[in-house]
Interface confidence: low
């Protein structure tokens, strides 16, 4: 967990003396953009608990890792939620403090409640100033539950939350109806993401067994230790008045940590410092109790005495939480005889030891070949052993040789030697070799001679367009295989470099020299052919085409359709940018025009062979629609259509075309010609009995005109299935005019 503590000074007689301090023990914390991480942020969070506006609070930075908030003018300024944010990147963490007004109607028996997933949480609001009205419970500012004022038990209103889940976490409040929100009891509920004693994705991992009231973090399994305790399992007490993950911080003032509330990263929450309790953390622990909020009992054995800050102080020859364990000589366990690391890495080396007294972090050390002694940065304490973890400074070749792990306790000492081999990551001496190239891919042989140590575990190929500032694309390949760089741009130069890796952390070597490889752009050789075309209107033409079926990927980026109007000497070009397309609708053409049409495949800027041309005559603009079309059933197989001629005709009508379709049918409509243009009625025969039909019609002069309105009519019943609709004249052949 991030080493971040939010301290609240609870000497509340004068709000102007109240302050909040956020302290980070992280390296480089709070220095902002000129150092490693973003600055510490300390602010009041008004999203849930809003207070009347007052003068702005003052933020003061004290050194690189501390920030303090002052300038509270009245008690109501203090009420609510404060947060401190620290740590960088994925470790960025928010610590929250909830402040209750000491004069509120309702006060929380306990502000912070940390519970496990699936537990029942009980929030208890104690009546401080009674009102005979209902109590409203809220969760994160939203209404949650109402309790009748008669439901107080023992002067307390209880909210029971069974089977809590992580989304139940947040700020809860209990408020008398129609009372000021500042008189509420505010609580913080923290629900760990796992059941008791478990952590990790799926909660499959077992917590280390945090001591002294430490809480197991559900994401990383580390113990978040109460203020005044340290160690992997919070097994060690700090000296009185100290806090922080390594006991590196000191409480301000002569009375130590009295009157201070400590808030730590979730899932710990807030508590008094070690040795103190009470709503304002001003009461010392009762005899036999110790730790944060005095929650722990000493129960010392074998003559041990209880210290309210650290617990049992054991006489010589005894150790353990209750002085229950006797001492014996320590021993180093299962140390590997040889370890291998890569140059310039900062590995972690573990050394495990057992003994009585139990070896602690400071009692295990690591000695390098040059005599430098390293102290462990972390220790994992288990029932049968302590494992010290050493963060080794950046390795150099001179670090190769024999290292030694040594453990010393009052029970004696032990040591083990082991060999460390420092290996040099491989660096390519030559550029990769181009084997074959296509328009959108390059086949590359990546394995080249190299300096440094093998074996080669992975080969990374980095590539990007020449002279580009964009990020490099990277492909990881098997050392023994050639690499195909795909989805490249045709006719483009690519800078390609190899990076080799050997096994282990930091095994990636420097990038090798670059080489320039250029993709091809072969001429498209496929000749399309025009499958068909049909006129969809006087200025619209639907064209479809095909390509020969050839094996392998299609060499092409799209199609170019060309329309040549010989009369006007004009060429129209239509780009179809998908090589998968096989049809296009050409619009905005000139009615009554003779066009020559062809299609060709293109690739980059190269055009393939054109299709054999087609000759298309667009009809001139057609006449207006016939008027007042009407349908009347005559029998079970005949319907009569009547209409009026179009108005304002540009010339004599050559024929009418009737469209017949079964209502709701999915098939293509049938077109029937009426070859006597002077007629204003026709009978459609051969229809099915008891069937609804749709009809519309248009006139033709040199070209087809606009459609009339659609009319609907049903044939009469009791007829036989007919062959299909006919009219005295022949069926029209309008359609594919190829």
């Amino acid at each position: 967990a991030v080493d971040l503590t939010l301290l609240a000074n609870l000497r509340l007689t004068d709000p102007q003396r109240f302050f909040l301090t956020c302290v980070s023990g992280e390296a480089g914390a709070g220095r902002g953009s000129d150092a490693w991480g973003p600055p510490l942020l300390l602010e009041k969070d008004d999203r849930i608990v809003r207070t009347p506006p007052g003068p702005p609070l003052r933020l003061a930075r004290n050194g690189s890792h501390q920030v303090t908030l002052r300038g509270f003018s009245k008690p109501s300024d203090l009420v609510g939620v404060f947060s401190c944010v620290g740590g960088a990147g994925a470790r960025r963490t928010r610590v929250i403090y909830v402040h209750n007004s000491p004069g509120a109607h309702l006060l929380p028996d306990k502000v912070t409640h940390t519970v496990n997933k699936g537990d029942t949480a009980v929030l208890s609001a104690r009546v401080h100033k009674e009102k005979q009205t209902d109590v409203i419970w809220k969760s994160n500012g939203s209404y949650f539950y109402t309790l009748d004022w008669h439901e107080a038990q023992d002067g307390r209103f209880l909210l029971q939350l069974p089977n809590v889940q992580p989304p139940s976490s947040g700020i809860y409040s209990a408020t008398y109806l129609e009372a000021s929100p500042l008189g509420s009891a505010f609580f913080r509920l923290i629900v760990r993401g796992c059941g008791a004693g478990r952590w990790g994705p799926g909660c499959t991992k077992e917590c280390p067994g945090c001591l002294h009231g430490g809480v197991c973090h559900d994401h990383d399994g580390e113990c978040v230790c109460p203020p005044g305790f340290t160690g992997t399992r919070c097994e060690q007490a700090c000296r009185e008045g100290r806090f922080g993950q390594s006991c590196q911080e000191q409480c301000p003032g002569i009375s130590g940590c009295r009157g201070l509330t400590f808030c730590l990263p979730d899932p710990y929450g807030c508590s008094c410092g070690s040795g103190w309790r009470g709503s304002q953390c001003q009461e010392a622990c009762a005899p036999g109790h110790f730790g944060a909020d005095c929650r722990l009992q000493c129960q010392c054995q074998n003559g041990g005495t209880c210290d309210r800050f650290s617990g049992c102080v054991c006489p010589s020859g005894w150790h353990g939480v209750h002085c229950e364990k006797s001492d014996r000589i320590p021993q180093i366990l299962n140390m590997a005889s040889e370890l291998e690391f890569n140059l310039e890495t900062m590995p972690r080396i573990n050394c495990a030891a057992a003994g009585n007294p139990f070896p602690v972090r400071g009692s295990i050390e690591l000695r390098k070949p040059d005599g430098t002694v390293l102290l462990s940065t972390k220790a994992i304490v288990e029932p049968e052993k302590t494992t010290a973890e050493f963060e080794v400074p950046r390795l150099v070749l001179a670090d190769s040789g024999f290292w030694e792990c040594r453990v010393s306790t009052s029970g004696g000492q032990d040591s083990r030697r082991f060999k460390v081999n420092v290996k040099v990551p491989p660096v390519p001496l030559a550029a990769p070799r181009l084997l074959t190239k296509q328009s959108r891919q390059l086949v590359v042989s990546p394995l080249v001679s190299f300096s440094g140590d093998g074996p080669i575990s992975t080969v990374r190929l980095h590539y990007r367009p020449q002279d580009s500032t964009m990020d490099w694309s990277t492909i990881v390949v098997d050392p023994s295989e050639n690499v195909t760089l795909m989805n490249l741009r045709p006719k483009t130069g690519y800078s390609v470099r190899v990076q080799l890796s050997r096994p282990g952390e930091g095994g990636e070597g420097a990038w090798g020299p670059p080489t320039l490889m250029t993709t091809d752009c072969p001429e498209p050789l496929l000749q399309p052919w025009l499958e068909g075309w049909h006129v969809e209107g006087t200025d619209r033409l639907r064209v479809s085409w095909s390509l020969p079926l050839v094996p392998g990927p299609l060499v092409g980026d799209g199609f170019l359709l060309r329309l040549w109007d010989g009369t006007r000497g004009q060429e129209r070009r239509e780009n179809v940018s998908s090589p998968q397309a096989r049809t296009a609708l050409l619009t905005g053409l000139t009615p009554g025009t003779h066009y020559q049409l062809d299609v060709q495949l293109y690739h980059c800027t190269l055009l393939g062979p054109a299709s054999p041309p087609a000759h298309v005559l667009l009809p001139p603009s057609g006449p207006p629609a016939p008027r007042h079309l009407h349908a009347q059933a005559l029998s079970d197989s005949e319907i009569q259509l009547t209409w009026k001629h179009p108005e304002a005709l540009p010339g004599p009508i050559s024929k009418y075309v009737v469209e017949v379709q079964v209502a709701g049918g999915a098939g293509d409509p049938l077109w029937i010609d009426v070859d006597r243009p002077e007629e204003t009625s026709t009978i459609i025969r051969g229809l099915n009995a008891s069937t609804r039909y749709l009809f519309r019609m248009r006139a033709s002069i040199q070209g087809l005109g606009d459609w009339s309105n659609t009319v609907e009519e049903s044939t009469l019943g009791n007829g036989l299935q007919a062959e299909g609709p006919v009219q005295e004249s022949r069926a029209a052949e309008e359609g594919l005019d190829q």
């Epitope: 050789l525 000749q527 052919w529 095909s546 020969p548 079926l549 050839v550 094996p551 392998g552 062979p609």
Partner: antibody, heavy 119, light 107 residues
Amino acid sequence: EVQLLESGGGLVQPGGSLRLSCAASGFTFSQYVMRWVRQAPGKGLEWVSGIYPSGGWTTYADSVKGRFTISRDNSKNTLYLQMNSLRAEDTAVYYCATVAAAAGAFDIWGQGTMVTVSS
Amino acid sequence: DIQMTQSPATLSLSPGARATLSCRASQSVSSYLAWYQQRPGQTPRLLIYGASSRATGIPDRFSGSGSGTDFTLTISRLEPEDFAVYYCQQYGSSRHTFGQGTKLEIK
């Protein structure tokens, strides 16, 4: 019905020439890629040559390159294979084949014509 | 050119049995692979194209699988008319090549 019908096979001496024809019917010949495939007696199939619809692009197996020429006459719906410098190992049944609907594989075959190269 | 290798050369099975024929390409042909059946005295007949698509009219006891370099033709229950020679063919390059064939005979 889609049909391919080969002709022009026969007996020829080593070093001689022969021209095979394949008449297509039942489909739009000019839109399809055409191939020749052969099968020596008791042996497996061997792809020989291919030609694309316009006739502008041809491919050959290494074993016949420089000796055989594939061509087509789209107006006559006919595919040809001109075989020069014939060798004994060219003895085989020669099939013409094309792709109608199988996205690249040969789903239409002729019945084959026998070519025997022997002295 | 891409070489195609079929195995086994001969496969002896009884009617009703399951047949598995293999074909390996010397380099990747993606899924551009076809299987043909040739009965004695007859022209080849397309069974499978695109490695796994059945050609028109082919019974569903024939199935193909694989991509890249390794392919399989499976006949789930052999019928008497299935005993023939089977060829694989790649068309992933413009120079097509066939395998040497697998003869499926009655045991």
